[in-house]
């Protein structure tokens, strides 16, 4: 039998920009209040199993408590909402992982080379470390035709799956996206024949 949690933390998947402030709330279910004879003032917040100081906690109403963190710098924190019930027995209500990092920088210095008769490799500078899962996508178009996207495995280069056509200009750019933002590099326009790597 699956046991329903006693309440929830919102947001459920918190991602915070490093150095900024962050507030989470824990909402207890009515049934939980009655079963354990508690209200939100009984909530104990913990980060990585250590109790959060009381001055960071606010009881909003009988079911809801909030916690505020200033200048978040740790890359990953386990945040839990717990209740003290029946003579100080601590009961876990809900837990989330709070991640912190940066939105992606605009990729710069985009360059491409063509391996004749094979494929095209493009490389770029992703900028500063984001400390978050960040997806880099190489995008390309010719006139009004969109080519397949190239998903980068390493975040600094991508080998396109198509063989570019010579003697027509294509446009190539890089998109970077994580939980904190989405950006695009400026595009470069070139005829692939001009980027052929001498064998």
């Amino acid at each position: 039998q699956l046991l329903e949690p006693c309440g929830y933390i919102y947001p459920e998947f918190p991602v915070v920009q490093r150095g900024s402030n962050f507030t989470a709330i824990c909402v207890l279910k009515e049934a939980c209040l009655q079963h354990y004879y508690v209200n939100a003032s009984y909530i104990v917040w913990k980060t990585n199993h250590a109790a959060v100081p009381r001055e960071q906690v606010t009881v909003i109403n009988r079911t809801t408590s909030s916690v505020t963190f200033t200048d978040v710098v740790l890359p990953s924190v386990q945040l839990t909402c717990n209740i003290l019930s029946f003579g100080q027995i601590e009961q876990n209500v809900y837990g989330v992982t709070m991640l912190s990092g940066f939105p992606p920088d605009k990729p710069t210095n985009l360059t491409c080379i063509v391996n004749e008769g094979k494929n095209m490799l493009c490389q770029w500078d992703p900028g500063r470390e984001t400390y978050l899962e960040t997806n880099y996508t190489l995008k390309s178009e010719w006139a009004t035709e969109k080519f397949p996207d190239c998903q980068s495995k390493h975040g600094t280069s991508c080998m396109v799956s198509y063989m570019p056509t010579y003697y027509v200009n294509i446009e190539v750019w890089v998109e970077a996206e994580n939980a904190l933002g989405k950006v695009s590099s400026e595009s470069i326009n070139f005829d692939p024949v001009d980027k052929v790597k001498p064998t």
Epitope: T144, K146, E171, W173, K182, E186, S187, I188
Partner: nanobody
Framework: QVQLQESGGGLVQPGGSLRLSCAAS?????TYWIYWVRQAPGKGPEW???????????YYADSVNGRFTISRDNAKNTVYLQMNNLKPEDAAVYYC?????????????????TGQGTQVTVSS
């Protein structure tokens, strides 16, 4: 004469919708990235959205993401900005701009609206 003409603005209540159009005359719109920019009274211009030449790539300002949708019909030489769930802070003159390539998103350079634009008013 080569020009872009914006239309479709008007007065709408908060929560309402409008569809703006950007039509090209004198040149083929399909060879350009199109950017929507807005400028509220007493404020600087703000990038709103862009669409690539094929229409396959779109970008939005955080303030409009999820509410606005940019699209293009290259056969009609027109780009559209569908604006839903409008808010009072969306009120501005909206302009479209053309660029031969992707300026990056969000663009670093300051937009310089040149056309007449179309006025969007959001008020109850």
């Amino acid at each position: 004469q080569v020009q872009l003409q914006e239309s479709g603005g008007g007065l709408v209540q908060p929560g309402g919708s409008l569809r703006l159009s950007c039509a090209a005359s004198g040149f083929t719109l399909s060879t350009y990235w199109i950017y929507w920019v807005r400028q509220a009274p007493g404020k600087g211009p703000e990038w709103v959205s862009t669409v690539s030449r094929s229409g396959g790539t779109t970008y939005y300002a955080d303030s409009v993401n999820g509410r606005f949708t940019i699209s293009r019909d290259n056969a009609k030489n027109t780009v559209y900005l569908q604006m839903n769930n409008l808010k009072p802070e969306d009120a501005a003159v909206y302009y479209c701009l053309a660029s031969v390539s992707n300026l990056g998103w969000p663009p670093v350079r300051a937009p310089s609206p040149t056309g007449q634009g179309t006025q969007v008013t959001v008020s109850s």
